[in-house]
């Protein structure tokens, strides 16, 4: 997260860490008991390595009682995503076992109603990504409050260029943005995911390159289905 | 456990240039940036800069631009910092370090000590 | 860039003793303050981050405060392995710079 401060601890009990090999890779959200949300490419180069979901986390290193670090039973890619595109960035991780719930781990609810956000409006993006250009990487969880920019504007040629497809959205990035490390996590608006960071690689804070989220209400579909 | 491998020492020439190496093991290299700090004899240390093994990308101390340039090799876990135009100046202890949590650097390698001399 | 200052440059002290080393940066750097030992060898070893979090295998002897521009370390119970030469970091602003250092010797 570039721009933004540390959050209030265990304030955003659906935050997930996806972990690789001990170290934290991506971000995710708790949106069942037993299962994380979070983004496709975040798994594309993890092939050999363990993959596990960290819940209940403020500090990444320092002890906390509501810590808990869980194997992943199944991680479920959208079937469209493909490595070179951000289009169906999404990926479902089955946890090995229900989350033990509790005032710092609990599910978010989801957007079903697909409807684009008002642009605007101010919502909420969480995450231990890098937090300036050296690749500083936060021991505790950070957030940033950004407006939700427009589709037209995010796909002038200026900025990306006709990609924003009506099953992504964009978000300001003008010094504050979420960044490496922050992909996979949640885009909260009024206290609902509405979107989840992409993956792919572009620059952090550049007001002509807008974060792009994945919106959830358009693939409720097929999250429903991989949840049944 | 996480380690970082660099060897010993080079002697070079003034004029020339050097790559120095560092090996990472113990640990998922493209999940941890990598350092290099920069020690005078007896001196303090000075940060040269920064690489990203994922992607390479770089962060310059704007003071090594076009004196240290980074690169990485992900098969062999390595990372690299080559010394242009050196001068004795350049003579010092060059580090490599993981990037650590909140700006710090949490593992260090043993140094490379480089002596720029006819 | 920004400056940091150790303003004493060896500290002499005995075994069992407890020793504060005191660190200062030129502007506010928001806790993003990390302190190093370095071993006559020129190995050199992460101690405490942010500016009172323990890395990892680091005895609890080693402690951290500060906030704004000064901080320090502080060494608790002395012993033979700690006598060496301690820099502080800040990791808030691009360059990223070091204190020039304070040598622990035995009185």
């Known amino acids: 997260i570039l721009g933004g401060r540390e959050a209030e601890a265990h304030a955003r009990p659906y935050m997930a860490s996806v972990q690789l090999n001990g170290a934290h890779l991506c971000g995710g959200v708790l949106v069942a008991e037993q299962w994380v949300l979070s983004a496709a490419h975040c798994l594309e180069d993890a092939a050999d390595g363990k993959v596990q979901v960290l819940l209940g986390a403020h500090s990444l290193s320092q002890p906390e009682p509501s810590k808990r670090l869980y194997d992943v039973l199944r991680a479920v890619p959208h079937p469209d995503s493909q490595p070179d595109t951000i289009d169906h960035d999404l990926l479902l991780l089955q946890l090995s076992e229900k989350a033990t719930l509790g005032p710092a781990v609990r599910p978010l609810p989801w957007q079903r109603v697909d409807r684009d956000v008002a642009p605007g409006t101010l919502c909420d993006v969480a995450g231990w990504g890098i937090v300036n250009h050296a690749g500083r990487r936060p021991d505790s969880l950070q957030h940033v409050l950004l407006p939700v920019l427009d589709r037209a504007t995010c796909n002038r040629a200026t900025h990306h260029d006709g990609a924003i497809t009506e099953r992504l959205m964009c978000a300001e990035s003008n010094r504050r943005d979420s960044c490496k490390g922050d992909s996979g996590g949640p885009l909260v608006c009024g206290g609902v995911l509405e979107g989840v960071v992409t993956s792919g690689s572009r620059v952090c804070g550049n007001a002509k390159k807008p974060g792009i989220y994945t919106r959830v209400a358009s693939y409720a579909a097929w999250i429903d289905s991989v949840l049944a | 456990q996480v380690q970082l491998q660099q060897p010993g020492a080079e002697l070079v020439r003034p004029g020339t240039s050097v790559k120095l190496s560092c090996k990472a093991s113990g640990y998922t290299f493209t999940s941890y940036w990598m350092h290099w700090v920069k020690q005078r004899p007896g001196q303090g240390l000075e940060w040269i800069g920064v690489i990203d093994p994922s992607d390479s990308y770089t962060n310059y101390n704007q003071k090594f631009k076009g004196k240290a340039t980074l690169t990485v090799d992900t098969s062999s876990s390595t990372a690299y910092m080559q010394l242009s135009s050196l001068t004795s100046e350049d003579s010092a202890v060059y580090y490599c370090?993981?990037?650590?949590?909140?700006?710090?650097?949490?593992?260090w390698g043993q140094g490379t000590s480089v002596t720029v001399s006819s | 860039e920004i400056q940091m200052t150790q303003t004493t440059s060896s500290l002499s002290a005995s075994l069992g003793d407890r020793v504060t080393i005191s660190c200062r940066a030129s502007?506010?750097?928001?806790?993003?303050l990390n302190w190093y030992q370095q071993k006559p060898d020129g190995t050199v070893k992460l101690l405490i981050y942010y500016p009172s979090r323990l890395h990892s295998g680091v005895p609890s002897r080693f402690s951290g405060s500060g906030s704004g521009t000064d901080y320090s370390l502080t060494i608790s119970n002395l012993e033979q392995e700690d006598f060496a030469t301690y820099f502080c970091?800040?990791?808030?602003?691009?360059?990223?710079?070091f204190g020039g250092g304070t040598k622990l010797e035995i009185k």
């Open positions: 970091q800040q990791g808030n602003t691009l360059p990223y710079t």
């Open positions: 502007q506010d750097i928001s806790n993003y």
């Open positions: 370090a993981r990037n650590g949590y909140d700006g710090s650097m949490d593992y």
